[in-house]
Interface confidence: medium
């Protein structure tokens, strides 16, 4: 903490001005009025203060607003935001998307810091749900944002917000997250025609159940192998060879290169070798001819 010293004669700050960069830390503490700083926060970001000087300015604001800064100050924090701790941010009530954008801009190009994560958490909780504009903003700054949320948090995303999601925003999502997002996407895109629907739904298919994959196989969608490899194994296993062939279209040849990887490997083990041979790809590992296939899951359900 900076010790209290009297402001030297003639150095009392009358405005937040670029010349303050040459004030020593103790002079800033003694000569800059916290209320003046709060009303002229918009100027601070344009002034190249040292990190040590920013510490002093933060200290002054902390003294003025011990219960947390008002949004009028928060919106203009600029680089001073980088000095805030998650504990500081938890005291804030940020309601304006413009404020959120202004602070995310400061951290642009960097990984999501604990401060940013706390800020976003406070903002979203304050809004009650992840609306489209918020999601638009967050994924623009952090493409991986959506995949950083828990399935429980994702459940608060309204289907209308799904329109803001880009394929790259889902790159790091795991199956549990896609299980939550897929039904929302299906609902959001339900009024689109076949080919347009597939383009939009494709990134979410890691959460699709078997019946939806069967339905897609009837629509000449030509799913690429990269998408197929991200499908839920339990959703792929019940598909027949004919259904997979229709689902992949010309991409079916790519199965050979992936035959040792899930879900292709597990799917092959469930197919009759005769059926696999019809693909002409040399896929091996299917059920030999003459063997009886027992659907144990069905048997368990009946007993």
């Amino acid at each position: 903490e900076v010790e209290k010293t009297a402001c030297p004669s003639g150095k009392k700050a009358r405005e937040i001005d670029e010349s303050l960069i040459f004030y020593k830390k103790w002079e800033l503490e003694a000569c800059v009025d916290a209320a003046l700083l709060a009303t002229q926060m918009d100027r601070v970001n344009a002034i190249p203060f040292t990190y040590e000087q920013l510490d002093v300015l933060k200290h002054k604001l902390d003294e003025l607003y011990p219960q947390g800064y008002p949004e009028s100050v928060i919106q203009h924090l600029g680089y001073l935001f980088l000095k805030m701790s998650p504990e500081d941010i938890r005291k804030w009530n940020v309601t304006s998307l413009e404020t959120l954008k202004a602070l995310l801009e400061v951290n642009k190009g960097h990984e999501m810091s604990p401060q940013v994560a706390t800020l976003i958490d406070r903002f979203v909780k304050g809004r009650g749900q992840l609306d489209k504009d918020t999601l638009d903003t967050l994924t623009a700054f952090y493409p991986g944002y959506l995949c950083s949320l828990s399935p429980e948090e994702l459940s608060s995303v309204p289907p209308s917000s799904i329109w803001a999601v880009r394929p790259q925003d889902l790159d790091t999502c795991d199956p549990r997250q896609l299980d939550v997002l897929y039904p929302k996407a299906r609902l959001a895109f339900q009024n689109m025609n076949g080919s347009e629907y597939f383009v939009k739904i494709q990134s979410f298919l890691g959460g699709a159940p078997t019946e939806d994959l069967k339905a897609l196989s009837q629509q000449n969608v030509s799913m690429d192998l990269a998408t197929f490899m991200k499908l839920r194994t339990d959703a792929v296993l019940p598909l027949t060879v004919a259904e997979v062939q229709k689902l992949l279209g010309p991409h079916v040849e790519g199965l050979k290169a992936e035959e040792r990887h899930r879900p292709v490997r597990d799917w092959i083990l469930r197919q009759r070798q005769d059926d696999l041979d019809t693909l002409g790809l040399g896929l091996q590992g299917g059920i030999p001819n003459g063997y009886l296939v027992l659907d144990l899951s069905m048997q368990e359900a009946l007993s």
Epitope: R14, E15, D17, E18, L20, I21, F22, P48, T50, Y51
Partner: antibody, heavy 117, light 107 residues
Amino acid sequence: EVQLVESGGGLVKPGGSLRLSCAASGFTFSSYSMNWVRQAPGKGLEWVSSISSSSSYIYYADSVKGRFTISRDNAKNSLYLQMNSLRAEDTAVYYCARLRGRVFDPWGQGTLVTVSS
Amino acid sequence: DIQMTQSPSSLSASVGDRVTITCRASQSISSYLNWYQQKPGKAPKLLIYAASSLQSGVPSRFSGSGSGTDFTLTISSLQPEDFATYYCQQSYSTPLTFGGGTKVEIK
């Protein structure tokens, strides 16, 4: 194009006075701190004085404190340096320079002040 | 006041040479160091700011490094137009102070 043009230099006797001017163009003069930097013949650079955008803050090097006065007229896009009680060691080329962030950029072409009897 | 010490005060080099100029501050100035080039009869011109950031329009053969008290200006391959005097300047606190300069001459 950002430009600074100094004027007012010349020969003056020790103890005399001189007023330098700097005309600015090509940028919003009222938004920047302005400075005077000098260079004695064959020597290095020495910062002389600084004035903030709205004249709220003024700084001087110890070597000129109490003798020189910096001022500005934002309406005229002009910077001034009133030099009193001049000494032989004040002989130098005086440059006007804009402070942008924490750097001097750009500089004027300079005006020569010679203090000699 | 923060004193800035430059070395060498002068050096002779040939076109194509790699040239290094050092600047030392009497106390830590973080990265608040600038480099200027001055040719005879001309005003100084900003080359590098914040220790390592190249000013727009300055050739990439110029580079700066360092933080705290020790800084370096490097010209990777000296060109005929680079023969001049170079100054470092701290912008950490007033009074703003310059190094004594390094004159780069033709060998």
